[in-house]
C-alpha cells in the first residue's frame, strides 16, 4: 500500500512539475524591467525565451518573436535546449510511469517489469528536473551579470546634459515557476525511485525453521510451497538465511539491477 501511495504521489508531483516546466518555458516573463530606483516609466518591458514584450500603461501590449536563430546569444540557446530536453524527458517519463503505476493493470505485466519502468521514469524525472533547474539558473546568472553591467553605466550621455536611461532587467515570474517546477519534478523522480525498491518481487521475511530428520536435512519454509531438501554434504550449498528462507541460487535468480537503489 505504501509503495502504491509513494509511486502515485511521485507521479502526481512529477506531473505538476512537468506542467510547470512547460508553463515556465512558454512564459514571456523570464526577465522583467527593473522598477526599483529607476524613473517611473509608462512602458514596461519583459522578455521570454521566445519573444520580448512591451506593455504600455495604456494597456496596449506588443510582443515580438525572436525570428533569428543565429543572432541569439549562445546562453539563451543553451537555456532553450535545457528546457526542451527537460520537457521531452519529463513527457517520456510520464508516459512510462503511467504504465508502471501499480494501480493500473496491463495484461500480465510482471512486478519486476513495473519496477524497471518505475525506476526508468524516476531517473527521467530526476534528469528532467535537473535540466529545468539548470536552465533557469543559467538564465538567472545571465541576468545578474547583465544587471550589474548595466548598473555600472546606468546613465550615459553627452556632458551630462542629455541622459539615456538604460533598461535593467531583473528576475521574472517564469524563473520562480521554473525553479519550483524543476524541484517538484526532481522530488517526484526521487519518489518514483524509492517506490521502485518496494515494487521489486516481494521477499517473505519469515525466520526459517530447520527440521532435522535422520539421514537428510530439510529446510522448511512456512507459508511457502518450496522446501529445499539436501542430502549429506550437499547441505552446505543450501544456506539458510537468517532473514528469510532463500537459497544462494534463488538470490541470483532475481535481477540485481535494483540493488543499488
Amino acid at each position: 500500500m505504501a509503495v502504491t501511495a509513494c509511486q502515485g504521489l511521485g507521479f502526481v508531483v512529477s506531473l505538476i512539475g512537468i506542467a510547470g516546466i512547460i508553463a515556465a518555458t512558454c512564459m514571456d516573463q523570464w526577465s522583467t524591467q527593473d522598477l526599483y530606483n529607476n524613473p517611473v516609466t509608462a512602458v514596461f518591458n519583459y522578455q521570454g525565451l521566445w519573444r520580448s514584450c512591451v506593455r504600455e500603461s495604456s494597456g496596449f501590449t506588443e510582443c515580438r518573436g525572436y525570428f533569428t536563430l543565429l543572432g541569439l546569444p549562445a546562453m539563451l540557446q543553451a537555456v532553450r535546449a535545457l528546457m526542451i530536453v527537460g520537457i521531452v524527458l519529463g513527457a517520456i517519463g510520464l508516459l512510462v510511469s503511467i504504465f508502471a503505476l501499480k494501480c493500473i493493470r496491463i495484461g500480465s505485466m510482471e512486478d519486476s517489469a513495473k519496477a524497471n519502468m518505475t525506476l526508468t521514469s524516476g531517473i527521467m524525472f530526476i534528469v528532467s528536473g535537473l535540466c529545468a533547474i539548470a536552465g533557469v539558473s543559467v538564465f538567472a546568472n545571465m541576468l545578474v551579470t547583465n544587471f550589474w553591467m548595466s548598473t555600472a553605466n546606468m546613465y550615459t550621455g553627452m556632458g551630462g546634459m542629455v541622459q539615456t536611461v538604460q533598461t535593467r532587467y531583473t528576475f521574472g515570474a517564469a524563473l520562480f515557476v521554473g525553479w519550483v517546477a524543476g524541484g517538484l519534478t526532481l522530488i517526484g523522480g526521487v519518489m518514483m525511485c524509492i517506490a521502485c525498491r518496494g515494487l521489486a518481487p516481494e521477499e517473505t521475511n519469515y525466520k526459517a525453521v530447520s527440521y532435522h530428520a535422520s539421514g537428510h536435512s530439510v529446510a522448511y519454509k512456512p507459508g511457502g510451497f518450496k522446501a529445499s531438501t539436501g542430502f549429506g554434504s550437499n547441505t552446505k550449498n543450501k544456506k539458510i538465511y537468517d532473514g528469510g528462507a532463500r537459497t544462494e541460487d534463488e538470490v541470483q535468480s532475481y535481477p540485481s539491477k535494483h540493488d543499488y537503489v
Epitope: A42, V43, N45, Q47, S52, V54, G59, F60, R64, V165
Partner: antibody, heavy 118, light 113 residues
Amino acid sequence: QVQLQESGPGLVRPSQTLSLTCTASGFTFSKYAMSWVRQPPGRGLEWVAFISNGGSYTEYNPSVKGRFTILRDNSKNQLSLKLSSVTAADTAVYYCARHDKGNALDYWGQGSLVTVSS
Amino acid sequence: DIQMTQSPSSLSASVGDRVTITCKSSQSLLNSGNQKNYLTWYQQKPGKAPKLLIYWASNLQTGVPSRFSGSGSGTDFTFTISSLQPEDIATYYCQNDYFYPLTFGQGTKVEIK
C-alpha cells in the same frame, strides 16, 4: 462614436474640495486607461493624473499629488477627479482623455472650466 | 521631471509652405524593448480640445491628413506640415509619453502670413 463628457461645479472657493466627473460612451470604457489634463487660461497643457483600465494603478503630477485623487467606476462608465485644498493656481479647463497605443491620448472631452476664486 | 523644449514658440507661414517644429527632451524617449520613441504630437485649435496627430514619434493617427509627419529619435524630434493649409492654424504640442509625469512642450503657435 467615442464621446467623453466632463461635468463640474465651475466656480469654487480657495481651500475647498470639488469633484469633476467624466462620462464615457461609444467604447468599452473598462478596456482603456484614462488621464486628466488641464490648461490654465491662455497657457499650455499640463498632465494631471493617470488611472489604469482596472483602476488599480494611478500616477499624479507632483504639483497635485496628495491633493487630487483620480478614480473610476467601470460599471457606470465614469471617471472622476477629486480636487481638494484648491488654490487660484488650479484654475483651468480640465479635460479627461483616453489613452491608446503609444500611451497617446486619442480622444478628449470638450473640457470643463474650473475657476478658483473667493 | 522630463523637460520638453519646443521651438519656435510661434511661427508665421504662407499657405502651401513647409512648416517644421522641433521638440527636444531632456532624456531619451526611446524604449529599448520595442525600439519605439514615446513622443506624441497634438494639434489644438482655439477654444477646442487637443487632437492627436502623431504617436510613437512618426505614426500618423487614423484620419489625420498625410501632410502631417513626424520624425526623430532619442531626444530630438521634428514635426512637419508639408504644405500648410488654412485649417492648420492652431497650436501644436509635443508630449513625453514615456516618463511620469507625462510632460508637454510649451506649444508652437502656427499662423498664416
